[in-house]
C-alpha cells in the first residue's frame, strides 16, 4: 500500500490534531532537553509542510520518508552540539542510520527537574487562557521524561487530562475534584510508561520472536475462544504496531493501532465476547479499552494438552516441519487454559518444552524421551507460586512501607554496586506489588505479581545499562528475558563486595525533613537504609530495624522541637554514633 507522499498519507489518516500531537511527542522523545517553544515551532513547520503535501502530493520533498523529513527538521536545532554533545553526530549520518543513532541516544533517566504541580487556581487559569498550549505542554513534559511512552496511548492520557480540567475547573471545590484525577493519571501514566518500556526492551534486546511469544501467551489468555490463526493474526499486527512505536515511527504506529482496533471490533465474534463495550467508544478510548480488556471465559470443553503435545506420534514430525509455529500452538493451547499463570511462566514452560523437543526429537526413541515432559513443568510452576505466597504473607504482616524496606535490604545485599537512587526507586516499586496483587483472588495473584515484577526489573535493567556497575545485574538482564525475575530472586549476598566506607555526611539531616510530604520522608529514610546496608552488608534484620526505629524517633523528636535545626545539629551526631555502635 504505497503512497506518493507518506507525510500526506499519515496527515489524512490521523487528522490534524492527532498528527500534531504525535509529531510533538516524537520530537520531545528524541530531543528531551529542548525547550517547549522550540518543539512547538518545529511541529508547526512540519504541519504546514504536511498540508502542502496533502494539497499536492507531487510538491517538492513530499516524497521523502518520514524519518528523512523529521530527522532533517531535528537537525536544524541550533544548539544541538552544546545541548546534546555527541548526539549531534547523528546529523552527519544518512537514513536509516541517522534515526538509529537518535534512538540510541534516548535517555531513560534524563536530567530533568521533577514536575511540580502548581496551585489548582493557577492551573485552571492556564487551562482557560490557552487550552491548546496547556495540553501540548502536558504531551511535551511527559514525552521528554518518558522517551518510550506509547505515543497513541499518551494522546489518550492527554484527552483524559483535558477532560479533568474541563470538568473540575467549573466545580465548586476545584481541588477536591481535580487532584485525585491528576494523581490517578500520574500513577497510571508511570505504570503505562514502564509497561511499554518492557515491550520496547523485549523487541530491541531480544528480537521480535521474543515479543511475539509474549503476545501469543497474553492474547491467548485474553481470548481463549479465538482460534490459533486468529490469535496469530492479532500477534503479527500488534508486533508491527509496537515495533513502529519503539522505533520512533509514531505516525505509522498510531495509524496501525487504529486499524487493529477497527479489525478487532469488526471481528468480535471470532475474538472475544468482552470487546463489545470497548467497540462503542471513540478511537483513543476504544484502543485503550481493547488493550486492557478482561480475559474472556475459557471454553468449557478443552481437551487435555497431552494428546497433541506428548502422546501423538506426530509431535517430532510437526515440530520439525515448523518449529516456531508448533511452539506457538503449544503456547496458545497452554495459555488459553491457564489465565492463572503469569505470561513469563508460560514462556518458561514453552522454552522448557522446546528444549525437550530439541533433545528428544534427535534421539533414538523420541517418545520415550519426551513422555514425561509435563512432569518437568512442575518445579517451574511451583517456584513463582511459592514466591507469591511468601511475599504476600510478608506484605500482609509488614504493610507496604516496611515491606519495601525488606526488599530494599534484600536487593541492596544482592547488588550493592547499584546506585542508591536506583535501588530506592526499584525497591519501592517492587514493594508496590503487595498492594497491587496480594488482595486479588488466588487465580489472579501470580499473573499480576510476576508480570508486574518483570516490568519493574526491566526498569533496573534499563537504568543499569546506561551505567553498568554490576556483572550480576548485567547477567540477569541480558541472558534471558523470561528468566530475569528468577535470576534476580536467586541472587544471594554479594560476598565479593567491599563495604562502602562510612560517610557521616550521608546521615546528616536538617530541619527541611519536617516539611517533606510523607512519601518524601519515606524516600529519605529508605535512602539512609540503603546506605547503611552498603556500609554493613552483613547487618542482621534486627540490627537494621533498631537503627531505623531510632532514626524515625530522632526525626519525630526534632520535628516537634521548637528549634528544629538546632535539634538536628545536636541529635544527628548522637544518632550516627549510636548507629555505628549498633552495627559494629
Amino acid at each position: 500500500d504505497t503512497h506518493k507522499s507518506e507525510v500526506a498519507h499519515r496527515f489524512k489518516d490521523l487528522g490534524e490534531e492527532h498528527f500534531k500531537g504525535l509529531v510533538l511527542v516524537a520530537f520531545s522523545q528524541y530531543l528531551q532537553q529542548c525547550p517547549f517553544e522550540e518543539h512547538v515551532k518545529l511541529v508547526n513547520e512540519v504541519t504546514e509542510f504536511a498540508k502542502t503535501c496533502v494539497a499536492d502530493e507531487s510538491a517538492e520533498n513530499c516524497d521523502k520518508s518520514l524519518h528523512t523529513l523529521f530527522g532533517d527538521k531535528l537537525c536544524t536545532v541550533a544548539t544541538l552540539r552544546e545541548t546534546y554533545g555527541e548526539m549531534a553526530d547523528c546529523c552527519a549520518k544518512q537514513e536509516p542510520e541517522r534515526n538509529e543513532c537518535f534512538l540510541q541516544h534516548k535517555d531513560d533517566n534524563p536530567n530533568l527537574p521533577p514536575l511540580v504541580r502548581p496551585e489548582v487556581d493557577v492551573m485552571c487559569t492556564a487551562f482557560h487562557d490557552n487550552e491548546a498550549t496547556f495540553l501540548k505542554k502536558y504531551l511535551y513534559e511527559v514525552a521528554r521524561r518518558h522517551p518510550y511512552f506509547y505515543a497513541p496511548e499518551l494522546l489518550f492520557f492527554a484527552a483524559r487530562y483535558k477532560a479533568a480540567f474541563a470538568e473540575c475547573c467549573q466545580a465548586a471545590d476545584k481541588a477536591a475534584c481535580l487532584l485525585p484525577k491528576l494523581d490517578e493519571l500520574r500513577d497510571e501514566g508511570k505504570a503505562s510508561s514502564a509497561k511499554q518500556r518492557l515491550k520496547c526492551a523485549s523487541l530491541q534486546k531480544f528480537g521480535d520472536r521474543a515479543f511475539k511469544a509474549w503476545a501469543v501467551a497474553r492474547l491467548s489468555q485474553k481470548f481463549p475462544k479465538a482460534e490459533f490463526a486468529e490469535v496469530s493474526k492479532l500477534v503479527t499486527d500488534l508486533t508491527k504496531v509496537h515495533t513502529e512505536c519503539c522505533h520512533g515511527d509514531l505516525l505509522e504506529c498510531a495509524d496501525d493501532r487504529a486499524d487493529l482496533a477497527k479489525y478487532m471490533c469488526e471481528n468480535q465474534d471470532s475474538i472475544s465476547s468482552k470487546l463489545k463495550e470497548c467497540c462503542d467508544k471513540p478511537l483513543l478510548e476504544k484502543s485503550h479499552c481493547l488493550a486492557e480488556v478482561e480475559n474472556d471465559e475459557m471454553p468449557a470443553d478443552l481437551p487435555s494438552l497431552a494428546a497433541d503435545y506428548v502422546e501423538s506420534k506426530d509431535v517430532c514430525k510437526n515440530y520439525a516441519e515448523a518449529k516456531d509455529v508448533f511452539l506457538g500452538m503449544f503456547l496458545y493451547e497452554y495459555a488459553r487454559r491457564h489465565p492463572d499463570y503469569s505470561v513469563m511462566l508460560l514462556l518458561r514452560l514453552a522454552k522448557a518444552y522446546e528444549a525437550t523437543l530439541e533433545k528428544c526429537c534427535a534421539a533414538a526413541d523420541p517418545h520415550e524421551c519426551y513422555a514425561k515432559v509435563f512432569d518437568e513443568f512442575q518445579p517451574l510452576v511451583e517456584e513463582p507460586q511459592n514466591l507469591v505466597k511468601q511475599n504476600c504473607e510478608l506484605f500482609e504482616q509488614l504493610g507496604e512501607y516496611k515491606f519495601q524496606n525488606a526488599l530494599l535490604v534484600r536487593y541492596t545485599k544482592k547488588v550493592p554496586q547499584v546506585s542508591t537512587p536506583t535501588l530506592v526507586e526499584v525497591s519501592r516499586n517492587l514493594g508496590k506489588v503487595g498492594a497491587k496483587c496480594c488482595k486479588l483472588p488466588e487465580a489472579k495473584r501470580m499473573p499480576c505479581a510476576e508480570d508486574y515484577l518483570s516490568v519493574v526489573l526491566n526498569r533496573l535493567c534499563v537504568l543499569h545499562e546506561k551505567t553498568p556497575v554490576s556483572e550480576k545485574v548485567t547477567k540477569c538482564c541480558t541472558e534471558s528475558l523470561v528468566n530475569r525475575r528468577p535470576c534476580f530472586s536467586a541472587l544471594e549476598l554479594d560476598e565479593a563486595y567491599v563495604p562502602k566506607a562510612f560517610n557521616a555526611e550521608t546521615f546528616t539531616f536538617h530541619a527541611d525533613m519536617c516539611t517533606l510530604s510523607e512519601k518524601e520522608k519515606q524516600v529519605k529514610k529508605q535512602t539512609a537504609l540503603v546506605e547503611l546496608v552498603k556500609h554493613k552488608p552483613k547487618a542482621t534484620k534486627e540490627q537494621l530495624k533498631g537503627v531505623m526505629d531510632n532514626f524515625a524517633a530522632f526525626v519525630e523528636k526534632c520535628c516537634k522541637a521548637d528549634d528544629k535545626e538546632a535539634c538536628f545539629a545536636e541529635e544527628g551526631p548522637k544518632f550516627v554514633a549510636a548507629s555505628q555502635a549498633a552495627l559494629a
Epitope: E227, F228, A229, S232, D314, C316, K317, N318, Y319, A320, E321, A322, K323, V325, F326, M329, E358, C361, A362
Partner: nanobody, 123 residues
C-alpha cells in the same frame, strides 16, 4: 514469490535407486522445515519424510523407513530424497513442501508445494 522445483524422477526397476532434488527460492529456506509427500495414482496424499531447518530432526513414514534418506543443503537451498530398494508401491508423484501458514501443521493445504516429479517403479 515462493518456488519449489522438484527433479530427479523417472522410471526404475524394483530394487533400484533414485535421488530426488527440490530447488527452493523465495523464502527463508535455512530456517524452514521441509517435507516430502507423495500421491500414488488414484490415491490421496501420503506423507513420506520431514527434515527440520537444521537437519537435526528427521522423521520417516513407516513404509519408507530404512530405504529412503532425506537431507538438505542450506547453502544451496536444496532438499534431497535418496530412494533405495524401490518397490512397485513407491510409484507416485513426489512433492516437496514447506509450511506456509494457517491453523494446523500437517494439514497440507497450509503448505507451499512444488509441481511434483513422477517416480515409476515397474519390472
Amino acid at each position: 514469490e515462493v518456488q519449489l522445483v522438484e527433479s530427479g524422477g523417472g522410471e526404475v526397476q524394483p530394487g533400484g535407486s533414485l535421488r530426488l532434488s527440490c530447488a527452493a527460492s523465495g523464502f527463508a529456506f535455512s530456517t524452514s522445515g521441509m517435507v516430502w509427500v507423495r500421491q500414488a495414482p488414484g490415491k490421496g496424499l501420503e506423507w513420506v519424510s520431514t527434515i527440520s531447518d537444521d537437519a537435526r530432526i528427521i522423521r520417516y513414514a513407516e513404509s519408507v523407513k530404512g530405504r529412503f534418506t532425506i537431507s538438505r543443503d542450506n547453502a544451496k537451498n536444496t532438499l534431497y530424497l535418496q530412494m533405495n530398494s524401490l518397490r512397485a508401491e513407491d510409484t507416485a508423484v513426489y512433492y516437496c513442501a514447506t509450511y506456509r501458514a494457517g491453523s494446523r501443521i500437517g494439514s497440507y493445504e497450509d503448505y507451499y508445494w512444488g509441481q511434483g516429479t513422477l517416480v515409476t517403479v515397474k519390472p
